[in-house]
């Protein structure tokens, strides 16, 4: 809601409106960039990121990236605009309330990424297949 006394600005992506001209509140996301992680072989992990930031642009969503190579495991937590690729991948699940990790093909490492659009949703990253909506049994539960 921009009240009438708030000036409008042209081509400004700090303000996101719906079709009725309402203003979108920004997302709150864990935002620690890249940190070493002990998350491995678990159904889900907490980010252990103590920084919750206000995303700069209201269209941004929360993102988490888990990477494992021969040397270490890292977890990246950020805000990102789902209209733009991240690490060369489209954020397909940006509207999800939960951060469900999906594996992406990256040479030389194991690479999982998730995105979501509820406050601090990238604090809890989920690897378990139970949460994957491509699972037909889960779809049955959802649509019953």
């Amino acid at each position: 809601t921009i009240p009438p006394h708030v000036q409008k600005s042209v081509n400004n992506d700090m303000i996101v409106t719906d079709n009725n001209g309402a203003v979108k509140f920004p997302q709150l996301c864990k935002f620690c960039d890249v940190r070493f992680s002990t998350c491995d072989n678990q159904k889900s992990c907490m980010s252990n990121c103590s920084i919750t930031s206000i995303c700069e642009k209201p269209q941004e969503v929360c993102v988490a990236v888990w990477r494992k190579n021969d040397e270490n495991i890292t977890l990246e937590t950020v805000c990102h605009d789902p209209k733009l690729p991240y690490h060369d991948f489209i954020l397909e699940d940006a509207a999800s309330p939960k951060c469900i990790m999906k594996e992406k093909k990256k040479p030389g490492e194991t690479f999982f990424m998730c995105s979501c659009s509820s406050d601090e949703c990238n604090d809890n990253i989920i690897f378990s297949e139970e949460y994957n909506t491509s699972n037909p049994d889960l779809l049955l539960v959802i649509f019953q």
């Epitope: 809601t1 009240p3 203003v23 709150l28």
Partner: nanobody, 124 residues
Framework: EVQLLESGGGLVQPGGSLRLSCAAS???????RMWWVRQAPGKGLEWVS?????????YYANSVKGRFTISRDNSKNTLYLQMNSLRAEDTAVYYC?????????????????WGQGTLVTVSS
């Protein structure tokens, strides 16, 4: 109907401090996450800081972290923003706004959700 009224703006030199207040009339102040939002001349809205109604957990934009402190006094229905180490780029009209649980959008022109704003000018 809750009305929001900001005060405390003014002219301050770079490096100086100001404390903004936002007084909310009405009895529902404690149900809302409260925000400070600013708009620099010719620019869009920037969401500066937020505070939860219970537990008073706080959030900040990267541009103000370590310089600004948000707080609230639920007994006085008042929101505050302590601004230290002010810079020229902090010059803006500062608004307070409220957000209900799970609310993602706010309708344009809802003055029960937005204050009228207070101007902060940082200049030598």
């Amino acid at each position: 109907e809750v009305q929001l009224l900001e005060s405390g703006g003014g002219l301050v030199q770079p490096g100086g401090s100001l404390r903004l207040s936002c007084a909310a009339s009405g009895s529902t102040f404690t149900e809302y996450r409260m925000w400070w939002v600013r708009q620099a001349p010719g620019k869009g809205l920037e969401w500066v800081s937020a505070i939860e109604p219970i537990g008073h957990r706080t959030y900040y934009a990267n541009s103000v972290k370590g310089r600004f402190t948000i707080s609230r006094d639920n007994s006085k229905n008042t929101l505050y923003l302590q601004m230290n180490s002010l810079r020229a780029e902090d010059t803006a009209v500062y608004y307070c706004a409220k957000q209900a649980p799970n609310q993602r959008y706010v309708a344009r022109g809802r003055l029960d959700y937005w204050g009228q704003g207070t101007l902060v000018t940082v200049s030598s």
